[in-house]
């Protein structure tokens, strides 16, 4: 889980070693609780590569880092589909693929990733400040989207084309490493909770270090399935503008950030309120949770308004592996 947890400053019961130890053992459960509750939050990664041989040709790769089965993927450009964006391709794991110009070839790479070769020329070249968006619908996570703008000026000859290896490693790390750490952390958390069960807890105070730092809030694990929107980052490799990647931030990212609300209505907020949390600077694409599935014909407990750009879908569709283009 790449979302940072912001833990409130704790007022130690007394100075000295015992106070320091108390501080540490009480901060740790908060961190672990955050990790446990947000464990397994899926995200979408997007990779854009300009072909060195054909300067007007681009390869867009998108993947879903989550445990659910993917029921549909759409790729659009010019912004999110439905908000000025134009659909480039729609991929269904069983019923095949449709693609539209300037898309040349859309295909499944794995059960959770797709690639799209795009042809552009002159003014329609994707490098001209184009935003690409990938949407994944999966069961049971719901609908997720990642978007970002291609840098306007670039020299594709300056950097080698990226390889999928880092993404595959990230996937394995997510499955193996994070799962192991979280399992250990959750067990340790239970141990700590049992130890502190009969001890009076010190009073929590909000952090004074930053007036904008969101306060930590604990929320029940039963609510975790409807947890607050997380804005983790997704790795982007682009040879459109080598060596520099924009920071995705509500005030410095793509223009469509302006349409995003600064709160998630009727959804419990996690320890880091997403609207004011800077996103790590490794990529300019962000993954935004768009909703959760419910059982067929049912609404989930929260029925509050979804995001402006990303409406809140609800409904099951579990699919098997990709069967390729019909």
């Amino acid at each position: 889980m790449r979302t940072e947890a912001q833990v409130p400053a704790l007022q130690p019961p007394e100075p000295g070693l015992e106070g320091a130890m108390g501080h540490r053992t009480l901060v740790l459960p908060w961190v672990l609780l955050t990790l446990c509750v947000t464990a397994g939050t899926p995200e979408v990664w997007v990779q854009v590569r300009m072909e060195a041989t054909e300067l007007s040709s681009f390869t867009i790769r998108c993947g879903f880092l989550g445990s659910g089965s993917i029921s549909l993927v759409t790729v659009s450009w010019g912004g999110p589909n439905g908000a000025g964006g134009t659909t480039l391709a729609v991929l269904h794991p069983e019923r095949g693929i449709r693609q539209w110009a300037p898309a040349r070839q859309a295909r499944w790479e794995t059960q959770s990733s797709i690639s799209l070769i795009l042809e552009g020329s002159g003014a329609s070249s994707p490098c001209a400040n184009t935003t690409f968006c990938c949407k994944f619908a999966s069961f049971p996570e719901g609908s997720w989207e990642a978007c970002g703008s291609l840098p306007p000026s670039s020299d594709p000859g300056l950097s080698a084309p990226p390889t999928p290896a880092p993404i595959l490693r990230a996937d394995l790390a997510g499955i193996l490493g994070v799962s192991g750490v979280l399992l250990f952390g959750c067990v340790y958390l239970l141990h700590l909770l049992r130890r502190h069960k009969h001890r009076p807890a010190p009073r929590l105070q909000p952090s004074r270090t930053s007036p904008q730092a969101p306060r930590a809030r604990a929320w029940a694990p039963s609510q975790a399935s409807q947890a607050a929107l997380h804005v983790p980052y997704a790795t982007i490799n682009t040879s459109c503008r080598p060596a520099t990647l924009d920071t995705a931030h509500p005030h410095g990212g793509p223009s469509w950030w302006a349409s995003l609300p600064t709160h998630a209505a009727h959804r419990p907020q996690g320890p880091a309120a997403w609207a004011s949390t800077p996103i790590p600077a490794r990529g300019s694409f962000v993954s935004v949770e768009n909703g959760l599935y419910a059982q067929a014909g049912e609404r989930p407990p929260h029925t509050g308004p979804g995001l402006t750009l990303f409406p809140d879908p609800r409904g099951p569709r579990a699919m098997e592996g990709p069967l390729g283009v019909r």
């Epitope: 095949g96 110009a101 619908a137 990303f310 019909r326």
Partner: antibody, heavy 120, light 110 residues
Framework: QMQLVQSGAEVKKPGSSVKVSCKAS????????ISWVRQAPGQGLEWMGG????????NYAQKFQGRVTITADESTSTAYMELSSLRSEDTAVYYC?????????????WGQGTTVTVSS | QAVVTQEPSLTVSPGGTVTLTCGTS?????????PYWFQQKPGQAPKTLIY???NKHSWTPARFSGSLLGGKAALTLSGAQPEDEADYYC??????????FGGGTKLTVL
């Protein structure tokens, strides 16, 4: 097999709006695109737009852009088409259609149609 | 917006063969237009016969087939029956997942 049942006939005044519903039954709803097509009396078919309910975003024919709104409610497996600023030439039978076995955004199964009459 | 053209009307004898075509103002029709063919009888909703150029539905009679022919989408009816008398519409897909119907062909089985 999937069935699409549409709402009943409507009579509207020019300048008003109409909202036609299309309820799906007999299959899953979320990741199957639903399209709206209309047919004026004695005329051919005209595609208005479509939506993939799971994503909630719709795309529209240029002709209807800004005047039509297509939405979907997954909890009731129902799609809606709202047409505003009605004119007499909007008098038509409005159909919903959705994919079933074809690739995404297909039109395999059709609703029975809803007659909308615009008259002053 | 692209214009999709069809023959306004065609006549076929019972048991005969007829081919309906569908062209586009943007050039040649390709499999990337995902051609559809629909049958519509008076007072009824359209019925999908062919999707994605040549794929048939379970309810599509075997005598109907779809293909690409000389830069156009084609619907061929071999062994026409009286019940095949209807209007036939083709549908093509264009960039941005937009769709355009042809004007329709009135098929008479005489």
């Amino acid at each position: 097999q999937m069935q699409l049942v549409q709402s009943g006939a409507e009579v509207k005044k020019p300048g008003s709006s109409v909202k036609v519903s299309c309820k799906a039954s007999g299959g899953t709803f979320s990741s199957y695109a639903i399209s709206w097509v209309r047919q004026a009396p004695g005329q051919g078919l005209e595609w208005m737009g479509g939506i993939i309910p799971i994503f909630g975003t719709a795309n529209y024919a240029q002709k209807f852009q800004g005047r039509v709104t297509i939405t979907a409610d997954e909890s009731t497996s129902t799609a809606y088409m709202e047409l505003s600023s009605l004119r007499s030439e909007d008098t038509a039978v409005y159909y919903c259609a959705r994919e079933e076995v074809s690739s995404p955004y297909g039109m395999d199964v059709w609703g029975q149609g809803t007659t909308v009459t615009v008259s002053s | 917006q692209a214009v999709v053209t069809q023959e306004p009307s065609l006549t076929v004898s019972p048991g005969g063969t007829v081919t309906l075509t569908c062209g586009t103002s943007t050039g040649a029709v390709t499999s990337g237009h995902y051609p559809y063919w629909f049958q519509q009888k008076p007072g009824q909703a359209p019925k999908t016969l062919i999707y994605d150029t040549g794929n048939k539905h379970s309810w599509t009679p075997a005598r109907f087939s779809g293909s690409l022919l000389g830069g156009k989408a084609a619907l061929t009816l071999s062994g026409a029956q009286p019940e095949d008398e209807a209007d036939y519409y083709c549908l093509l897909s264009y960039s941005g997942a937009s769709w355009v119907f042809g004007g329709g062909t009135k098929l008479t089985v005489l």
